[in-house]
Amino acid sequence: MSSKYPRSVRRCLPLWALTLEAALILLFYFFTHYDASLEDQKGLVASYQVGQDLTVMAAIGLGFLTSSFRRHSWSSVAFNLFMLALGVQWAILLDGFLSQFPSGKVVITLFSIRLATMSALSVLISVDAVLGKVNLAQLVVMVLVEVTALGNLRMVISNIFNTDYHMNMMHIYVFAAYFGLSVAWCLPKPLPEGTEDKDQTATIPSLSAMLGALFLWMFWPSFNSALLRSPIERKNAVFNTYYAVAVSVVTAISGSSLAHPQGKISKTYVHSAVLAGGVAVGTSCHLIPSPWLAMVLGLVAGLISVGGAKYLPGCCNRVLGIPHSSIMGYNFSLLGLLGEIIYIVLLVLDTVGAGNGMIGFQVLLSIGELSLAIVIALMSGLLTGLLLNLKIWKAPHEAKYFDDQVFWKFPHLAVGF
């Protein structure tokens, strides 16, 4: 017997989503316009390509990376696309309101789309911890709250700590991870008897998850360099990210084999660990002066990722109810912290090298930024979790967790899909 989409959600979701979309259209109508100047078409195309890379990362990369569940692969990919599409729209408006609005209309440029895509990516990282346990109506709430929280965090950090676009966006890893984990902590945890198989991975969905990981691996240099202000910085970021992710792949595959008693390679470890270097190098990718440093960082990140994937899932499953294959949350939280620590180390070296006696103050500022990102992520994540628990959203019953048939029409109605 196929499980139908709950009637109440069928009323709630279209009304909620379409009303929201109508509101967004009205906001765009009244408050935005395009950048009028178009002098250099070649420059425009080059600038668009960066945005395109980010969209590929988000839609294909993160969409497929989260699709490894046996019975929840369709929902993972499509819900990711839905959240990306909604998140980008809201992020463009929010960034415009926070940065430009007092002086008039929000000007939409390719850069603002780039920024918005990266903000929406935060939600796609976070949602890995809750996918399969929530419906689309709940995900809409999550998108709105997380994009708003991240936008405000970035504004506060830029104003208080005087950091640029790249630096305040690179808190995204830590922010998204802790946000997702705190939302997951609020949701009902136990999987009832008989549904344990649904959160297991299957071969074909695992292959598509690997495809997602490959797309992310290919485009991670674009992500880490997208918001940098000069070609020198961007070049450094691309090179360093590339070296870091290259080494983390080698480390992930060999480390996964090392971690298994029979020397076998775990798909789950590899999906996540191949990206480890990109996350760990993110904050300081434009500052690392030579390839070997980025490579060492990739190596350490790969080892941490494999180690985390081996020992943390048990804890996360018990405490947060996160399935074994959804390891992005704790992976990014560890690697994001590693990246922030590396930045602070570089900062200390730089301050010492410059003969500047303000080491303590500079380090304090950086720790302050990181702490603020974590605090806002946890608080907004808990708020979101509490909101998602409201009866109004008609959340799927625990017995229907990780089940595509709750949401999708399958003509053959194959229960074992």
Partner: antibody, heavy 126, light 108 residues
């Protein structure tokens, strides 16, 4: 020799438009962010606008936001400032300036306006 | 927006004097500060960036210091060609990149 040459200034009536150009030579124009800075007669320097090296991001002073548009054509090594709805208080010498990166080893990149043009005078008559 | 306040606005000094100009930011700007010299009818000239780094070709008698909100430009021994107007400018992470109101250095 690194050089910036502004042109397009002149006398214009209040409410009308003017377009300033800044021709760059002696360096790879597409690698640098560019600024417009103005100086009213007998007054101090006022930053007006900034554009990233690839044109993807632009900033404006509050006093000109919504009226002025900065743009660049990297294929022509030229920076532009489109000034619409001009007011008497926009009368000034307008300078274009190159932003150069001053690399610090690890923690930050610092920037500075290291090369300036000779300026072009814009007079808005009421 | 970050406001930059220079003091003094006018300064009279003699050749050979040691002169200090102060610039205060309304909020912390780390070391994102530059100093410019401008002579009448000419474009500004960059002297110092990153609060204390001397631009190439600028005489070593010019020096800069400070971090956060308090910055100083010091000319250790004034030369005749140093009489001009000096501006500080903050180049923090986001525009507007405001200038100080200027300090006019005159011959006593």
């Amino acid at each position: 020799e690194v050089q910036l040459v502004e042109s397009g200034g002149g006398v214009v009536q209040s409410g009308r438009s003017l377009r300033l150009s800044c021709a760059a030579s002696g360096f790879t124009f597409s690698n640098n962010g560019m600024h417009w800075v103005r100086q009213a007669p007998g007054k101090g320097l006022e930053w007006v606008a900034f554009i990233w090296y690839d044109g993807s991001n632009k900033y404006y002073a509050d006093s000109v936001k919504g009226r002025f548009t900065i743009s660049r054509d990297n294929s022509k090594n030229t920076l532009y400032l489109q000034m619409d709805g001009l007011r008497a208080e926009d009368s000034a010498v307008y300078y274009c300036a190159r932003e150069e990166i001053a690399a610090r080893l690890y923690s930050r990149y610092h920037y500075a306006m290291d090369v300036w043009g000779q300026g072009t005078m814009v007079t808005v008559s009421s | 927006d970050i406001q930059m306040t220079q003091s003094p606005s006018f300064l009279s000094a003699s050749v050979g004097d040691r002169v200090t100009i102060t610039c205060r930011a309304s909020q912390g700007i780390r070391r994102y500060l530059a100093w410019f010299q401008q002579k009448p009818g000419k474009a500004p000239k960059l002297l110092i960036f990153s609060a204390s780094t001397l631009q190439s070709g600028v005489p070593s008698r010019f020096s800069g210091s400070g971090s956060g909100t308090e910055f100083t430009l010091t000319i250790s021994s004034l030369q005749p060609e140093d009489f001009a107007t000096y501006y500080c400018q903050q180049l923090s992470s986001y525009p507007p990149y405001t200038f100080g109101q200027g300090t006019k250095l005159e011959i006593k």
